[in-house]
């Protein structure tokens, strides 16, 4: 014997209080498939939130993220706050990357400079919190006669310590 | 169902006080991170204060420092915002928030807030 409620179709639910008719989901609430004895509630998009797309009778509301912070995990499950460039989030809130590491984007880690001379080369470019260093030719590399300009060393700055 | 509803918000002259409230249902809130964030008008939102899950760790923005306190009453799955000798840019919606699964370990991601009350501060 087929089940009655396998003819309900997406956006209703099998009603078994009326004979098990295919009834509308009532309103703020979804089901994305067909045969469902339930409708789904509503995703809600508020607060840190916000909608991206609306909910209908057949599909979940999607969220992202208020303007300030951004999405973490599968769907947006979370928003997670934005730094400037130049600095990590801590449990204490935004703080300027250490001397010697950099981060270049409103999240993420501050990460280490690169080691020029681990690949036998010279810092052309000194780091900053925002920027890594950029590595230039080995000296090896350069032309008989050729001006090789050593850069200063970079003036420490006032890094935070470790969190 | 898992809910945060704010309350407390108005309007307060500069240098005046506010106490806002929220209200948890529907999971312990002493399994978690809690924040306030706040949104000014026509502004991004910003991060305002966070406690752990027992109240020993709590933390501010710059420009709150001094002047507001986050504490919270997990007998009563509630927490709460004191704010104190408040100025004008101190006006916006503020939020509670729930610090998501793993917050502090793995990432500081917000998963379920409120609706938000409003704060006015005016002469």
């Known amino acids: 014997l087929q089940d009655p409620c396998s003819n309900c179709p997406a956006g209703t639910f099998c009603d078994n209080n009326r004979n098990q008719i295919c009834s509308p989901c009532p309103p703020n609430s979804f089901s994305s498939a067909g045969g469902q004895r339930t409708c789904d509630i509503c995703r809600q998009c508020k607060g840190v939130f916000r909608t991206r797309k609306e909910c209908s009778s057949t599909s979940n509301a999607e969220c992202d993220c208020t303007p300030g912070f951004h999405c973490l995990g599968a769907g947006c499950s979370m928003c997670e706050q934005d730094c400037k460039q130049g600095q990590e989030l801590t449990k204490k809130g935004c703080k300027d990357c250490c001397f010697g590491t950099f981060n270049d984007q409103k999240r993420g880690i501050c990460r280490p400079w690169t080691n020029c001379s681990l690949d036998g080369k010279s810092v052309l470019v000194n780091g900053t919190k925002e920027r890594d260093v950029v590595c230039g030719p080995s000296p090896a590399d350069l032309s008989p006669g050729a001006s090789s300009v050593t850069p200063p060393a970079p003036a420490r700055e006032p890094g935070h310590s470790p969190q | 169902q898992v809910q945060l509803v704010e309350s407390g918000g108005g309007l307060v002259k500069p240098g005046g006080s506010l106490r806002l409230s929220c209200a948890a249902t529907g999971f312990t809130l002493s399994n978690y991170w809690m924040n306030w964030v706040r949104q000014a008008p026509g502004k991004g939102l910003e991060w305002v204060a966070n406690i752990n899950q027992d109240g020993s760790e709590r933390y501010y923005v710059d420009s709150v420092k001094g002047r507001f306190t986050i504490s919270r009453d997990n007998a009563k799955n509630s927490l709460y915002l004191q704010m104190s000798s408040l100025r004008a840019e101190d006006t916006a919606v503020y939020f509670c928030?729930?610090?998501?699964?793993?917050?502090?370990?793995?990432?500081?991601?917000?998963?379920?807030s409120g609706q938000g009350t409003t704060v006015t501060v005016s002469s």
């Open positions: 928030a729930r610090g998501g699964e793993g917050y502090g370990v793995d990432h500081y991601g917000l998963d379920v």
